[in-house]
């Protein structure tokens, strides 16, 4: 059922792939120590090696089910007819501390399995209590979770999980915090972290909201932990813009949701509209996001410490069509520092009694903020009043890159040697490689420097993940996982092409004459051995720049700029024709042109000149590493006085013998010569 690795698309060398033609792929995670890849799919969970060979497959479905059966048929007989039902993997998380994989599906009201990482052996499948049912919604990319490990040696691990509920608010909370027990069969598994008769670690969509807006739901696009907070990026029906009339047009809004990790009562719940705008165009439909560190250059430009978090996001244009958003999309940047500051300001103003809680979907009454003398700092986690809280002003990101033609669907990022590299997946199955640097030429904050095909014509899904060593990017479509190298420096065959590519991974390894990463270039830290800037490409001049084909062993003086120490020696190489020894003196290279005998085959049948590449060849590496054009000219091919003396070379016309020569002495003294045209 799993395809063998085969070639990727396009003109690049073949990429490693894993194909699952029968079952749609939905989620992908990579183990940060082993580099092994776990893939969630419809009815299957796969374990792959880092180079995408299939190691294990675990069957999760189809199952005999009916989504109307609550609790599921495995727990209680059900009056509704059962049928073979696909089990769509909706959540796939690595629990490193317990050496297990958490895989939650759509079947049986959304139960989860715990699988052993080594062999995908099923350790447990809690399914008999209402807390075990997360949501029966089938849409794969709508649920998100964050696994919080317990303090070492004590305390409880927990799962923050957000999910759409498809109107079933009596069955499923939209957001909750659940216990993760060491024993997969523990009765408390997935129990709410806190629960009493008034409050618990959950948030439900009120039935009043669903009565008024039957289509209301919250779709969880991305979740992450930053410092002591858990964040979610969500898409939800905009109840301000959408009319309650079911036939009316639906508008959506993106929200960033925040909770304190250690807030079991959810008093810290805050949500804010989020988006970005460029040239008057609003991008409001969040497609994906990725938490990253900024890389030194970007950190300095943004005035951040290098260990602060930034959030790269992709938004589609407008607020309509959640399922098929417009193609026009934007890559945007948020700093967590700015997000935290905006949230803090909102909380502070509410605790000064200003405005309302402003959360219409959750609070049916417009509740006012209550004045309180509390000190609100960056770490504030709420009280039993002035919560839950909604932001009224959109948190705006910095637009980095707009794609008008091929919608952006996924994003990942990392820091390579201080530079910030972003990878964006597209609808057509491409990976765009983008350098984020506010000091890019032309004031563009992001430069798309390369685009490669992962799978032609198939949208890249959200789980775009880097390998632990940052050498590869795993890109997933519904049918295939592709391992894309983060760089293909070797494709650039000259220093100018290499550094002109603007790929931050690539530099020119001078004496090896190859485009590579710095760490793949021998002795790269020695001066001028590794060029990282176009200005550092080797320049070469030669004097004289041309010689006559009849001249033998002419002394040549070459001057080279941006070269490393050449004391190991260099040769002069005239293409592949001939090579001569050189001497280094006063920073110049002295060598000789070929003998007349060696020149003859180079110039035969070539007219009045033959341009060849004169190379410097390193004795240390045996590679040609710099070149300059060198000309062998042949006066004797000219048959007329005019063509002889009007050419580019110092040719002389012997008046009486009617021959063209470079050597004045060839013309008999008495017959005279012409070296400029005479009327």
């Amino acid at each position: 059922e799993a395809g063998l690795p085969r070639a990727g698309g396009g003109s690049q060398p073949p990429f490693r792939t894993f194909s699952a033609s029968d079952w749609g792929l939905t989620h992908l995670v990579v183990h940060e120590q082993t580099g092994e890849v776990y893939v969630g799919a419809v009815n299957r969970i796969y374990k792959l090696s880092g180079n995408l060979t299939l190691l294990r497959a675990h069957v999760t479905g189809p199952v005999e089910d009916n989504e109307k059966c609550y609790p599921p048929p495995s727990v209680q007989s059900c009056p509704h007819g059962l049928g073979s039902t696909d089990n769509v993997n909706k959540l796939l998380l690595l629990d490193y501390a317990a050496n297990r994989l958490l895989a939650c599906g759509s079947a049986s009201q959304g139960i989860c399995q715990f699988l052993r990482l080594d062999d995908l052996f099923k350790l447990g499948e809690p399914h008999h209590r209402k807390e075990h049912y997360l949501s029966s919604v089938q849409e794969a990319g709508s649920m998100a979770g964050v696994l919080i490990a317990g303090p070492p040696g004590q305390g409880q691990a927990k799962l923050f999980v957000g999910t759409p509920i498809d109107g079933k608010s009596e069955y499923f909370p939209t957001l909750s915090s659940r216990r993760l027990m060491a024993n997969e069969e523990d009765a408390d598994m997935f129990g709410f972290v806190y629960q009493d008769e008034f409050v618990s670690s959950q948030l439900k969509i009120p039935s009043d909201t669903l009565s008024k807006f039957p289509a209301f739901d919250i779709y969880y696009v991305y979740s992450f932990r930053s410092e002591q907070f858990v964040y979610y990026l969500t898409l939800q029906l905009d109840t301000q813009l959408t009319s309650p009339d079911a036939a009316g047009e639906h508008f959506f809004t993106s929200k960033i949701v925040r909770l304190c990790v250690d807030d079991p009562k959810f008093y810290s719940y805050v949500e804010f509209p989020i988006g970005c705008e460029q040239a008057g165009v609003e991008y409001r439909l969040v497609q994906d996001a990725y938490l990253s560190r900024p890389g030194r250059a970007l950190a300095h430009q943004l005035g951040l410490a290098e260990d602060e978090d930034v959030l790269f996001t992709v938004f589609a244009q407008g607020q309509k069509n959640r399922v098929k958003p417009p193609k026009e999309s934007a890559l945007c940047l948020f700093t967590l520092r700015a997000i935290k500051e905006k949230i803090k300001e909102r909380i502070q103003s509410c605790y000064r009694g200003e405005g309302k809680l402003s959360l219409p979907w959750l609070l049916n009454k417009e509740l006012g903020c209550i004045n309180s003398p509390l000190q609100i700092d960056d770490d504030f986690c709420g009280q039993d009043f002035n919560q839950p809280l909604g932001g009224t002003v959109t948190i705006e990101g910095t637009p980095l890159f707009v794609d008008k033609d091929d919608g952006l669907t996924a994003v990942a990022a990392y820091d390579y040697r201080g530079r910030t590299v972003v990878f964006a997946g597209t609808r057509s199955g491409r990976i765009r490689k983008i350098l984020v640097d506010l000091s890019n030429p032309g004031g563009r904050p992001a430069l798309a420097y390369e685009s490669v095909v992962a799978q032609e014509g198939s949208p890249i899904l959200r789980d775009l993940v880097l390998s632990p060593n940052h050498q590869y990017l795993y890109a997933m479509t519904e049918k295939q996982v592709t391992r894309v190298p983060v760089e293909s420096c070797v494709q650039y065959t000259s220093c100018e092409l290499c550094l002109g590519s603007r790929d931050p991974h690539c530099g020119w390894c001078v004496l090896h004459s190859i485009c590579s990463r710095r760490d793949a270039c021998e002795r790269a830290d020695e001066p001028q051995r590794f060029a990282a800037d176009l200005l550092q490409c080797v320049q070469l001049t030669v004097q004289p720049r041309n010689v006559s084909v009849t001249m033998s062993q002419v002394p040549l003086v070459l001057q080279a700029w941006n070269v490393p120490d050449l004391s190991a020696g260099v040769n002069c190489s005239f293409e592949d024709f001939t090579e001569s020894e050189s001497v280094l003196e006063d920073g110049r290279i002295h060598c000789r042109s070929p003998s007349a005998r060696e020149v003859a085959p180079i110039t035969r049948g070539q007219g009045d000149q033959r341009v060849v590449k004169l190379y410097l060849k390193s004795k240390e590496t045996g590679k040609k590493f710099a070149s300059v054009d060198f000309v062998f000219y042949n006066c004797s091919v000219h048959q007329s006085c005019l063509s002889c003396v009007n050419g580019s070379f110092p040719c002389h016309w012997c008046k009486y013998r009617h021959v063209c020569t470079h050597n004045v002495a060839d013309c008999a003294f008495l017959e005279g010569r012409v070296n400029v045209s005479e009327d």
Epitope: Q301, R417, G418, S439, D525
Partner: antibody, heavy 119, light 112 residues
Framework: EVQLVQSGAEVKKPGASVKVSCKAS????????ISWVRQAPGQGLEWMGW????????NYAQKLQGRVTMTTDTSTSTAYMELRSLRSDDTAVYYC????????????WGQGTMVTVSS | DIVMTQTPLSSPVTLGQPASISCRSS???????????LSWLQQRPGQPPRLLIY???NRFSGVPDRFRGSGAGTDFTLKISRVEAEDVGVYYC?????????FGQGTSLEIK
């Protein structure tokens, strides 16, 4: 041409404040940070701190914390450095310098502003 | 704070001859991102400093290639292959790996 032009020389009394300006031209001001460096007469260079022209975030040298404030005005592409509670050992030439692409090397320097603190 | 120590403090050189300035840091300047943020600046008399070299060995644009930087970890060198009259001034090394960023005390290059 990329350049940083600083305000003119100042003479101040101990305890007073001074505010030096640095006007940038020839590049996108918000794309680079600005550092301030001072040089006491006959002495070496001392880094004072840095400001992001993108959003005004700052990082000051510990020994000047509380006395120095760096700001920017993006509408005029100008950076400012204010030093308060001046002492005689603050007498120096004050330079603004643009942080290079990685923020790690100062690639463009202002001409310097001489600040003399004397009673 | 990182202490940057330059030697010699003064270097009299004959025109056309080479010159070498050493700079040693009190701890490694290799940043967690793999780069080493060590630069060299030249300050001619009565002028502001000017960037010559960044990240150990990269010449800044417009800097003649007689200037060459090398080194690793804690030991760095600036070499001038053939000194010209316009090279007279004070040379500073500077580290920007660790906050606060710090400079060497300077090496004065003068013509014999």
């Amino acid at each position: 041409e990329v350049q940083l032009v600083q305000s003119g020389a100042e003479v101040k009394k101990p305890g007073a404040s001074v505010k030096v300006s640095c006007k940038a031209s020839g590049y996108t001001f918000t794309s680079y940070g600005i550092s301030w460096v001072r040089q006491a007469p006959g002495q070496g260079l001392e880094w004072m701190g840095w400001i992001s022209a993108y959003n005004g975030n700052t990082n000051y040298a510990q020994k000047l914390q509380g006395r120095v404030t760096m700001t920017t005005d993006t509408s005029t592409s100008t950076a400012y450095m204010e030093l308060r509670s001046l002492r005689s050992d603050d007498t120096a030439v004050y330079y603004c310098a643009r942080g290079g692409r990685g923020g790690d090397a100062f690639d463009i320097w202002g001409q310097g502003t001489m600040v003399t603190v004397s009673s | 704070d990182i202490v940057m120590t330059q030697t010699p403090l003064s270097s009299p050189v004959t025109l056309g001859q080479p010159a070498s300035i050493s700079c040693r840091s009190s701890q490694s300047l290799v940043h967690s991102d793999g780069n080493t943020y060590l630069s060299w600046l030249q300050q001619r008399p009565g002028q502001p400093p000017r960037l010559l070299i960044y990240q150990i060995s990269n010449r800044f644009s417009g800097v003649p290639d007689r200037f060459r930087g090398s080194g690793a970890g804690t030991d760095f060198t600036l070499k001038i292959s053939r000194v010209e009259a316009e090279d007279v001034g004070v040379y500073y090394c500077m580290q920007a790996t660790h906050f606060p960023w710090t400079f060497g005390q300077g090496t004065s290059l003068e013509i014999k």
